[in-house]
């Protein structure tokens, strides 16, 4: 599942990781936009051994596979779910 | 060529302990996630865990996760199998198994011949 | 959990025959299906990947295809060394095997 999170929080990332994840172990992917207290793009992956991951966006593997997810969003929807917190 | 050779399993008793290796050749262990898959007698395959390339993050079937502990020696090229408080039902063929490496689309593709383990008193 | 209904559970076949085996997945797997060919006394060996992607030197008489939650794995010109257990893996999320096929030859 991808999501999509617009929020007033400052940066939750301290540390990024461009290291691979196979999608098998892979539960959901949050995406953090820049702004609003936070000057980058964060993407955190929540894995299936209950474990987060901060995964470095210019992350080619990321990148890839967060184009499969929007690619199979917009033929099957819900899936991935878009959240927006409105601070 | 690839090769994945499991130590010697054997007969243990119940409650008690065990530790199985296997020692891979032929590519380069560090840039390959591992698991073990293990088939009980007259069944089918079973996952039982696997190891990410320098052992920092691990994954187990749910039922095992409290007595089974992925390790790995990326300086041996060894990759390990701590099995505790065993029970009758973990009796099985225990198989090392090289996962994916870089490529979401690739499964589990080189296997060893297996290891027995007999859990009886 | 995904959970991966594999059918039959035995058959038998001709030399020469055809053969197709089935794997349902309780839910989509998005194409990551693999395919193994198990033998006693051996580890199993793996066929296909990603539905349809052959494995280097495995022959062309096998096959798979499938998408959504069904699959399917055929063996074409059966030869005698075909005989073994065949089993589906679905690694979409974690892994889960079917319960395999044994296949004779009549």
């Known amino acids: 599942v991808l999501e999509v999170y617009y929020t007033s929080l400052r940066c939750r990332c301290v540390q990024e990781s461009s290291v691979f994840i196979p999608r098998r172990f892979i539960d959901r992917i949050q995406i953090l936009p820049r702004g609003n207290g936070c000057p980058r793009k964060e993407i955190i992956v929540w894995k299936k051994n209950k474990s987060i991951v901060c995964v470095d966006p210019q992350a080619e593997w990321i990148q890839r596979m967060m184009e499969v997810l929007r690619k199979r969003s917009s033929s099957t929807l819900p899936v991935p779910v878009f959240k927006r917190k409105i601070p | 060529e690839v090769k994945l050779v499991e130590s010697e399993g054997g007969l243990v008793q119940p409650g008690s302990s065990m530790k199985l290796s296997c020692t891979a050749s032929g590519f380069t262990f560090s840039d390959y996630y591992m698991a073990w898959v293990r088939q009980v007698p007259e069944k089918g395959l079973e996952w039982v865990a696997n190891i990410n390339y320098d052992g920092s993050d691990t994954y187990y079937l749910d039922s095992l996760k409290s007595r089974f502990i992925i390790s790995r020696d990326n300086a041996k090229n060894i990759l390990y199998l701590q099995m505790s408080s065993l029970k009758s039902e973990d009796t099985a063929t225990y198989y090392c198994?090289?996962?994916?490496?870089?490529?979401?689309?690739?499964?589990?593709?080189?296997w060893g011949q297996g290891t027995s383990v007999t859990v009886s008193s | 959990d995904i959970q991966m209904t594999q059918s039959p559970s035995s058959l038998s076949a001709s030399l020469g025959g055809k053969v197709t085996i089935t794997c349902k997945a309780s839910?989509?797997?998005?194409?990551?299906i693999a395919w193994y060919q198990h033998k006693p006394g051996k580890g199993p060996r793996l066929l296909i990947h990603y539905t349809s992607t052959l494995q280097p030197g495995i022959p062309s008489r096998f096959s798979g295809s499938g998408s959504g939650r069904d699959y399917s794995f055929s063996i074409s010109n059966l030869e005698p060394e075909d005989i073994a257990t065949y089993y589906c893996?679905?690694?979409?999320?974690?892994?889960?095997f079917g319960g395999g096929t044994k296949l004779e030859i009549k």
């Open positions: 839910q989509d797997i998005n194409k990551y």
């Open positions: 198994v090289r996962d994916v490496a870089y490529d979401d689309s690739y499964a589990m593709d080189y």
């Open positions: 893996l679905q690694y979409d999320s974690l892994y889960t």
